[in-house]
């Protein structure tokens, strides 16, 4: 008699999963020399610690402690860039500009990205049918709670002056519900942290707006000011100029505004 | 280039010790999981036994468990397995591999040596 398996609304586990954490791992430690400590073996033994034999739908913080110890690496706090619904943008960026990073450039969001990933309550198996979704099924699930792990921990680690990448073709250019707007806004440090400055990323190419003054961003000026937090903005008009300028600063095109 | 040169194999008696080594080559030794995958006359591979890359994991194949025991020198970039209490069965050529880790069961091999051919014999 087959076994009854709970069907979930979103998609299963990626394919080929222990593999490809493991291979990122390795391919990590070998290109970052100050991780080189760490052990692959133990990084995905806790990671499929944290959600193996566990309802997915009951996965806590808790549970991945033992691979965020394992996986503890110190950034520069003064070079963190966060994003909101323009990963790509933010990661071509950070390829470009060597010294800043955003988590996925971090070993534990560099395992993670683009990955899904749960088990089933009392058995061992990973689950490649289905995972739970956040919206239709539940938000304790092992991807959404592995992301606000690591995005809050990222952000309470940030200091001095922390950049953060908007999507200026989006409805909500910040969003309250974003892991941005809902986890990494409320955990920079004040103590530490002197200015938030977002970059508004134009998609149009004769889009002139100043989306500084859109009245999401206004609400974020808000959020971040009450916490004691200077709060600046920036519209980023040609996203290809700026990063071709990123790449080349000294080319005369890139005195005049991007 | 990789490469995963086994030494140590020969001849011994049932009940007697052998100590197999590699040395290592052409990687970043430190990073990787290295295991002894061996293929006894006439039958599929088989998964001996795994270390990871610190050596603070380690794995073994039931058939092996006890008798056998891995380590490595990541300052020598060498993987060792010492083996006793050795059976007619355990005759096989072994090969020392290199990979990303395993789960469970499953090893993720990258690279693997020649082999060096182990006989337990009396």
């Known amino acids: 008699v087959p076994r009854w398996r709970q069907q979930w609304s979103g998609p299963g586990t990626t394919k080929r999963f222990p593999e490809t954490v493991l291979a990122r791992c390795v391919k990590y430690t070998e290109i970052h020399p100050e991780m080189r400590h760490v052990d692959c073996q133990s990084v995905w033994d806790a990671f499929k610690g944290a959600f193996i034999s566990k309802h997915p739908c009951n996965i806590t913080e808790e549970d991945y402690q033992p691979l965020m110890k394992l996986g503890t690496q110190t950034v520069p706090c003064n070079k963190i860039l966060l994003w909101s619904r323009i990963k790509d943008l933010a990661h071509q960026f950070t390829q470009v500009q060597r010294d800043m990073f955003t988590l996925e450039d971090t070993l534990l969001g560099y395992l993670a990205d683009d990955l899904t990933w749960c088990g089933e309550f009392n058995t061992s198996k990973i689950n490649y049918q289905s995972c739970p979704d956040w919206r239709k099924d539940c938000s304790n699930n092992p991807v959404s709670v592995f992301w606000k792990t690591v995005s809050r921990r990222f952000a309470e680690a940030a200091c001095d002056v922390v950049h953060v990448m908007l999507n200026g073709s989006r409805s909500k250019i910040f969003d309250k519900n974003s892991t941005f707007g809902s986890v990494e806004v409320h955990n920079l440090q004040p103590e530490k942290v002197q200015t938030l400055e977002a970059w508004v990323i134009h998609g149009g190419r004769e889009d002139s707006r100043d989306l500084c003054q859109d009245p999401t961003i206004k609400e974020l000026e808000s959020i971040i000011s009450k916490r004691n937090i200077q709060f600046s903005c920036k519209n980023i008009y040609r996203p290809d100029k700026f990063l071709q300028c990123v790449k080349n600063p000294e080319d005369s095109s890139c005195t005049s505004e991007i | 280039e990789v490469q995963l040169l086994e030494s140590g194999g020969g001849l011994v008696q049932p009940g007697g010790s052998l100590r197999l080594s590699c040395a290592a080559s052409?990687?970043?030794?430190?990073?990787?999981?290295m295991s002894w995958v061996r293929q006894a006359p006439g039958k599929g591979l088989e998964w001996v036994s795994g270390i990871s890359g610190s050596g603070g994991s380690t794995h073994y194949a039931d058939s092996v468990q006890g008798r056998f025991t891995i380590s490595r020198d990541n300052s020598k970039n060498t993987l060792d397995l010492q083996m006793n209490s050795l059976r007619a069965d355990d005759t096989a050529v072994y090969y020392c591999?290199?990979?990303?880790?395993?789960?469970?069961?499953?090893?993720?091999?990258?690279?693997r040596g020649q082999g060096t051919l182990v006989t337990v014999s009396s």
């Open positions: 052409g990687f970043i030794f430190s990073v990787y999981a």
């Open positions: 591999a290199s990979g990303k880790g395993w789960d469970g069961n499953t090893w993720y091999e990258d690279y």
